[in-house]
Interface confidence: low
């Protein structure tokens, strides 16, 4: 589960690489592109048919400390009348991101990238209907 | 993960905030543990909002492949499979995190950046705006 | 689970080609992948394919040699490998996974075939 090196089709490695020990790397946590802000349609949350809602989680050992995950609110789908339709399921959009994580050894700190998957929000999809002989 | 040395007075000297630069392993640690296996991967065709993935490849970005998702109508996919333009389709959008190679084309040199992604689609009930 | 069992490996000649199948028992809209093996080696990625076959990810040791598709209506994956060289002697897989992010990472990839051995030598 290593980063692929840049293969050698694309480039020559540049002479001006910083020097970095076997097996890590070295990665600069000033984020590029940080103040870049979602421009998302207002509330889609609670306007879609399948509606969700949001729970940050803080964890002050990994970087970004918040994450925040959508939970559906339903099983279904909100049809035109406002009522819930059990023959339509709310499904879970899911993006992986990376995180970095700290770890504490005694007296010592490592750090390790970690892929976390965020559920970013629900979609109404018709159900696969599993037909039993 | 590589290990380095904290201050002399350890116990008492936690720092709270992180480095600018970092070590790292090369090995990404994976803790996928809330996915669920059974979840299928054709939400972009069975939903009423339904998106096409746009592949977007950068060989100094890691992961150098990331899908964009598109909806594929303004509008949303009814009961009987036409499109209903009183629901109007619109991208989810996620902020995620991703490495640059920094210098450029170094094999283990790497800078965090925060990019815009379109993840999927869902159906929503338009804001009708009334102009008196 | 799904079920698959792949068929097609061998042994042929550098420069040869082979065409890799794997039959899913069950519909499967997941994306798949190929994955190999070699003697004394990791388990490495190969090709994936989406769902709907649309959209398609080779490694590089692999790209403009081997081609991955997919035929929904029979529930089959496929693996057409062409210029076969020896470095591609392995034990190959078909697995499900859950998208196309990250598709390099074998511990991805959720249901597994029994695999098939491809031997290119002379």
């Known amino acids: 589960r290593k980063i692929p090196k840049v293969g050698h089709t694309f480039f020559q490695k540049p002479e001006s690489c910083p020097p970095v020990p076997g097996g890590s790397m070295k990665l600069d946590i000033g984020i590029i592109n940080e103040n870049q802000r979602v421009s998302m349609s207002r509330n889609i949350e609670s306007r879609s048919t399948s509606p969700w809602n949001y729970t940050v989680t803080w964890d002050p050992n990994r970087y970004p400390s918040e994450v925040v995950q959508a939970q559906c609110r339903n099983l279904g789908c909100i049809n035109a009348q406002g009522k819930e339709d059990i023959s339509m399921n709310s499904v879970p959009i899911q993006q992986e991101t990376l995180v970095v994580r700290r770890k504490h050894q005694g007296c010592s700190v490592s750090f390790q990238l970690e892929k976390v998957l965020v559920t970013v929000g629900c979609t109404c999809v018709t159900p696969v209907i599993h037909h039993v002989q | 993960g590589i290990t380095i040395p904290r201050n002399p007075g350890c116990p008492n000297s936690e720092d709270k905030n992180f480095p600018r630069t970092v070590m790292v392993n090369l090995n990404i640690h994976n803790r996928n543990t809330n996915t669920n296996p059974k979840r299928s991967s054709d939400y972009y065709n069975r939903s009423t909002s339904p998106w096409n993935l746009h592949r977007n490849e950068d060989p100094e970005r890691y992961p150098s492949v990331i899908w964009e998702a598109k909806c594929r109508h303004l509008g949303c996919i009814n009961a009987d499979g036409n499109v209903d333009y009183h629901m109007n389709s619109v991208p989810i959008q996620q902020e995620i995190l991703v490495l640059r190679r920094e210098p450029p084309h170094c094999p283990n040199s790497f800078r965090l950046e925060k990019i815009l992604v379109s993840v999927g689609c869902t159906c929503v009930t338009p804001i009708v705006h009334h102009v008196a | 689970d799904v079920q698959l069992v792949e068929s097609g490996g061998g042994l042929v000649q550098p420069g040869g080609s082979l065409r890799l199948s794997c039959a899913a028992s069950g519909r499967t809209y997941d994306a798949m992948g190929w994955l190999r093996q070699a003697p004394g080696k990791e388990r490495e990625f190969v090709a994936a394919?989406?769902?709907?076959?649309?959209?398609?990810y080779y490694a590089d040791s692999v790209k403009g040699r081997f081609t991955i598709s997919r035929d929904n209506s029979k529930n089959t994956l496929y693996l057409q490998m062409n210029s076969l060289r020896p470095e591609d002697t392995a034990v190959y897989y078909c697995?499900?996974?859950?998208?196309?992010?990250?598709?390099?990472?074998?511990?991805?990839?959720?249901?597994w075939g029994q695999g098939t051995l491809v031997t290119v030598s002379s």
């Open positions: 697995a499900t996974r859950r998208g196309l992010y990250y598709v390099w990472d074998a511990n991805d990839y959720e249901n």
């Open positions: 394919i989406s769902g709907s076959g649309d959209d398609t």
